[in-house]
């Protein structure tokens, strides 16, 4: 039975981020309803992606370690689309963390997931990066710029926004 | 050559105020992080608080906060620590240290030959 | 904060032996094979010096008998072999994140 197996396969995959998901917000992709795009609840989904808001206060390589350890990674930002809908959810007193850093103090900035770093596709405030020891990137609010890039010392606490993949099933 | 002079350590009743300053000079005090670490008689070393190139980062352990200042003036290639409602538990050696970051975090590569604080009545 | 365990507190060593002295984290001090750990020596009257940044870089001017191992959790500084001017105590301290933390040291006798 089609409908049986198709069942079985999903209570399988379910089962899979049951660990660290327990619960999962699901939607129908497009007509078919045997697609099913997830995220886990309560992170929030744009496009392909999830997105968590972490709180706690953490370095750099923690939050990037407590990303990971629910399956994600530290947020890395391809659109100024994907940054609009981002910032819906911050705080504007606040700084968050994303997936990139400068580990080598020689400005050559790293995605986490090992996306190219495309100079053209950056947010940064005015300024910035400006300190060879800021080695890891946040994005924060400023009234004069609104909501930018700015680089920080890694071991200094941030929130932090982690991103995965939508689980489809 | 990398000294770092610290001055300013002496006798203080509990609930006094003292100022430590620390002079650098042998490299561009303004390109690097800078920490106070202090050290009780006979015990180990404790971090105290840390100040940013830049300025624009500060940070202390909870056993110090709200009483002890990090600053620092880089034309005068001078670090300072203002220490208010000093305790008896303050009483150490202070150490001026310069960090050196490396990767995500830093180390402290020159140490100068501290200052003694004593605080009793 | 990272509490360092630092062990034995303290050890007496012959003049040409090994010295071996481990710091414990309690929890990983590491991130993609890079481990912030460090190691000073004091010698008494003295402020700390580095010796040892990143668990395993000999720093500039460090006799090579010191030499630094470990990862994650578990660091171990070396001496071999010990020479009488290396009566001292020896600190590890991490930086992975803030608050920047000292272990209590150990202290090392030579006989």
């Known amino acids: 039975n089609f409908m049986y197996s198709k069942t079985v396969k999903r209570l399988s995959k379910l089962r899979e981020y049951q660990q660290y998901h327990p619960s999962l917000t699901c939607v129908m992709e497009g007509k078919d309803i045997e697609d099913w795009s997830c995220c886990p609840t309560p992170w929030t989904s744009f496009q392909s992606s999830c997105y968590f808001i972490s709180t706690g206060m953490q370095s750099w390589t923690k939050s990037q370690k407590n990303c990971s350890v629910m399956g994600a990674d530290l947020v890395v930002i391809n659109t100024r689309e994907e940054q609009d809908f981002i910032i819906q959810n911050l705080k504007r007193n606040s700084s968050y963390f994303l997936g990139l850093s400068d580990p080598g103090g020689r400005r050559h900035w790293q995605w986490v997931d090992q996306t190219p770093y495309n100079e053209n596709v950056t947010f940064w405030h005015s300024g910035e990066p400006n300190n060879l020891d800021e080695r890891c990137a946040i994005i924060n609010f400023r009234s004069s710029e609104e909501w930018g890039w700015n680089d920080i010392h890694c071991h200094v606490p941030q929130k932090s926004i982690c991103k995965m993949k939508k689980i489809y099933i | 050559e990398v000294q770092l002079v610290e001055s300013g350590g002496g006798l203080v009743k509990p609930g006094g105020s003292l100022r430590l300053s620390c002079a650098a000079s042998?490299?561009?005090?303004?390109?690097?992080?800078m920490s106070w670490v202090r050290q009780a008689p006979g015990k180990g070393l404790e971090w105290v608080s840390t100040?940013?190139?830049?300025?624009?980062?500060?940070y202390y352990p909870d056993s110090v906060k709200g009483r002890f200042t990090i600053s620092r003036d880089n034309a005068k290639n001078s670090l300072y620590l203002q220490m208010n409602s000093l305790r008896a538990e303050d009483t150490a050696v202070y150490y001026c240290?310069?960090?050196?970051?490396?990767?995500?975090?830093?180390?402290?590569?020159?140490w100068g030959q501290g200052t003694t604080v004593t605080v009793s009545s | 904060d990272i509490v360092l365990t630092q062990s034995p507190a303290s050890l007496a060593v012959s003049p040409g032996q090994r010295a071996t002295i481990t710091c414990r984290a309690s929890e990983s001090v590491s991130f993609h094979g890079t481990h912030l750990m460090h190691w000073y020596q004091q010698k008494p009257g003295q402020p700390p010096k580095l010796l040892i940044y990143a668990a395993s870089n000999l720093e500039s001017g460090v006799p090579a008998r010191f030499s630094g191992s470990g990862s994650e959790t578990d660091f171990t500084l070396t001496i071999n072999p010990v020479e009488a001017e290396d009566t001292a105590n020896y600190y590890c301290?991490?930086?992975?994140?803030?608050?920047?933390?000292f272990g209590g040291g150990t202290k090392v006798e030579i006989k």
């Open positions: 042998g490299f561009t005090f303004s390109s690097y992080g």
């Open positions: 100040i940013s190139s830049g300025d624009s980062y500060t």
């Open positions: 240290a310069r960090q050196l970051y490396y990767s995500y975090g830093y180390y402290f590569d020159y």
């Open positions: 301290q991490q930086s992975i994140e803030d608050p920047p933390t």
